[in-house]
């Protein structure tokens, strides 16, 4: 305990702040999503579809995607995967078009969060196997990947 | 860098905290939602359906709504819009009653988040096209708008 | 105001950090969910399905569950309840299998968050009446309960 030692307290204090808020790129052509570099980036780098951690610590990560599905004759499973260093860390699934009827369109919104310790140079990415259903036309700003540092490493 | 200068460190430290957690008003009569003033408010004002920012900085904003739809003969698109200064900043949509069958009821839950820099007197509001479907009777406490200041402006 | 008094500033500064990120237990046998103790726990205890608060303050609480439903002939309401000291504080509902058709399976993802002041020894738990539909086999890591202390009590 260093409750009376000012410098000690400050050295251990969680002052560091890092955050990002990126919107999905307009044109998607693969399951690994790409993001617009002109979003909010502070203490985090963006490179080749990845957020790259620059300061170690406990991060809150949240991704939200807006889907628009032209229903085929069968149901469709929409999946959102959060990857840390190319490993699936968390995923969310939802089934749409479950009635099996061909309808004009069906909207669906899917979110995923994670609270995890991340080291320097850790990469965060998002994978969606049905990327063609991500609504980059009607609602391009709704598809986001965001993180913030909750507590930096002591 | 001022790593050994205590006052310098403290002056730059992100101490400021502001937050709000408001539940939707019991009686809704328009697309712009109203909120109960007796929620949690700290460093933020509530006025005419708006949260009004009092300290500039990077805010995490999250809204969650619980819908209850008496399905008509057609599908229904539920929409949640987050507005900053009366401009749509982020929206989420989901389609319910997609089978086109008249059913007793369908529950749906919709969330929306945002991480954004906000200035003093910035207003945050929520708009819902189908406000009549917001479940204020069975689950009135489930419809919430919440924010917290992540990092105050230097 | 103690803007020049270093120790005063530090005593009032929101340095305290507490957090948890727990994944659901593999085998569920009751509506109150159990969690794996080997998750992330810092400044919070886990006991008998409850997170137990050790430091008072304003907490952000978030729970996310992944459901897999073998549709019967009728629609199914999935419900997620967040309980504080055994009292329902917030719940989310979504209806699946709404077409009333027996299908192979339907995925659904449900989230719930809360921002609330919690005292020492406050318990946080999660209740799901249709716990048999929580997907602990295909996607066991997707069902999580997480909290972090946003602002400690002055």
């Amino acid at each position: 305990d260093c409750s009376e030692d000012l410098l000690c307290i400050l050295k251990r204090a969680p002052f560091k702040k890092s955050w990002a808020y990126l919107q999905v790129a307009k044109h998607l052509d693969k399951t690994k999503l790409s993001w617009n570099k002109d979003g909010i980036l502070h203490g985090v780098r963006y490179q080749d579809g990845n957020l790259v951690i620059q300061f170690p610590g406990l991060y809150f990560i949240i991704c939200q995607l807006q889907f628009l599905v032209q229903c085929p004759n069968n149901s469709v499973d929409l999946k959102l995967e959060l990857l840390i260093n190319k490993h699936i860390k968390k995923q969310a699934l939802v089934t749409v078009c479950e009635s099996g009827m061909q309808t004009k369109h069906v909207y669906q919104n899917l979110s995923q969060f994670l609270l995890d310790y991340l080291q320097v140079n850790t990469t965060i990415s998002v994978n969606v196997d049905t990327f063609q259903y991500i609504d980059t036309s009607t609602f391009p700003l709704e598809n986001v990947l965001s993180i913030f540092l909750y507590s930096n490493s002591d | 860098d001022c790593s050994e200068d205590l006052l310098c460190i403290l002056k730059r430290a992100p101490f400021k905290k502001s937050w709000a957690y408001l539940q939707v008003a019991k009686h809704l009569d328009k697309t712009k939602l109203s909120w109960n003033k007796d929620g949690i408010l700290h460093g933020v004002r509530y006025q005419d359906g708006n949260l009004v920012i009092q300290f500039p900085g990077l805010y995490f904003i999250i809204c969650q709504l619980q819908f209850l739809v008496q399905c008509p003969n057609n599908s229904v698109d539920l929409k949640l819009e987050l507005l900053i200064n009366k401009h749509i900043k982020k929206q989420a949509l989901v389609t319910v009653c997609e089978s086109g069958m008249q059913t007793k009821h369908v529950y749906q839950n919709l969330s929306q988040f945002l991480l954004d820099y906000l200035q003093v007197n910035t207003t945050i509001s929520v708009n819902v096209d189908t406000f009549q479907y917001i479940d204020t009777s069975t689950f009135p406490l489930e419809n919430v708008l919440s924010i917290f200041l992540y990092s105050n402006s230097d | 105001d103690c803007s020049e008094d270093l120790l005063c500033i530090l005593k009032r500064a929101p340095f305290k950090k507490s957090w948890a990120y727990l994944q659901v237990a593999k085998h569920l046998d009751k509506t109150k969910l159990s969690w794996n103790k080997d998750g992330i726990l810092h400044g919070v205890r886990y006991q008998d399905g409850n997170l137990v608060i050790q430091f008072p303050g304003l907490y952000f609480i978030i729970c996310q569950l992944q459901f897999l439903v073998q549709c019967p002939n009728n629609s199914v309401d999935l419900k997620l309840e967040l309980l504080i000291n055994k009292h329902i504080k917030k719940q989310a509902l979504v209806t699946v299998c709404e077409s009333g058709m027996q299908t192979k399976h339907v995925y659904q993802n449900l989230s719930q968050f809360l921002l609330d002041y919690l005292q020492v020894n406050t318990t946080i738990s999660v209740n799901v009446d249709t716990f048999q539909y929580i997907d602990t086999s295909t996607f066991p890591l997707e069902n999580v309960l997480s909290i972090f202390l946003y602002s400690n009590s002055d």
Partner: antibody
Framework: QVQLQESGPGLVKPSETLSLTCTVS????????WSWIRQPAGKGLEWIGR???????NYNPSLKSRVTISVDTSKNQFSLKLSSMTAADTAVYYC??????????????????WGQGTTVTVSS | QSALTQPASVSGSPGQSITISCTGT?????????VSWYQQHPGKAPKLMIY???NRPSGVSNRFSGSKSGNTASLTISGLQTEDEADYYC??????????FGGGTKLTVL
């Protein structure tokens, strides 16, 4: 500079379906959102609907049951079909460029580029 | 969806200022700052004069200005000129993701 040109029949019989096409020149149709508007003689403007590059649409609720808007990106054209025409549908029909997304914002500029309009008369 | 309410006509002499009002509801004008104004001369297509309540597209004279209070938007034309004589329409984005127009106002320059 983007220019729009409406084309289609000037005369339609009652109960038939109107088909109009709007050709976009000077820019890619995929970069924007597009609307149809009409104006009966001596009356005000009425918004009919819009289409996105994805083919998704929004329609005026009062016309929704009769309207179909489609897009052909390969031809840089979008089209309007209005079924069950009556004399009340006699009007000048305009196509226009709708709101757009730039950077991290939605820009609801309104309808900033219009075609010159085409007159449609419903008569037997 | 109901049309926005505008006065059928207004008039003014050259050099004067006039204001045209546009009243909507809490589902359109009241909730968004997405009000636009159009000028239409006889036999011509409408021309965008104001967007997002008070912004002017490039090429539009600064004599044209817009404002909004509650559910009512306004277009003000200062230093009235003969070429300003035309029909003026307001429009607003709505909660249903549609546009709604006003009934139009005929401006006469005396």
């Amino acid at each position: 500079q983007v220019q729009l040109q409406e084309s289609g029949p000037g005369l339609v019989k009652p109960s038939e379906t109107l088909s109009l096409t709007c050709t976009v020149s000077g820019g890619s149709i995929s970069s924007y959102i597009w609307s149809w508007i009409r104006q009966p003689a001596g009356k005000g403007l009425e918004w009919i609907g819009r289409i996105y590059a994805s083919g998704n649409t929004n329609y005026n609720p009062s016309l929704k049951s009769r309207v179909t808007i489609s897009v052909d990106t390969s031809k840089n054209q979008f089209s309007l079909k209005l079924s069950s025409m009556t004399a009340a549908d006699t009007a000048v029909y305009y196509c226009a460029r709708d709101y757009r997304v730039a950077g991290t914002y939605y820009y609801y500029y309104g309808l900033d580029v219009w075609g010159q309009g085409t007159t449609v008369t419903v008569s037997s | 969806q109901s049309a926005l309410t505008q006065p059928a006509s207004v008039s003014g002499s050259p050099g004067q200022s006039i204001t045209i009002s546009c009243t909507g509801t809490s589902s359109d004008v009241g909730v968004y700052d997405y009000v636009s104004w159009y000028q239409q001369h006889p036999g011509k297509a409408p021309k965008l004069m104001i967007y997002e309540v008070s912004n002017r597209p490039s090429g539009v004279s600064n004599r044209f200005s817009g404002s909004k209070s509650g559910n009512t938007a306004s277009l003000t034309i200062s230093g009235l000129q003969t070429e300003d004589e035309a029909d003026y329409y307001c429009s607003s984005y709505t909660s249903r993701s549609t546009w709604v127009f006003g009934g139009g106002t005929k401006l006469t320059v005396l």
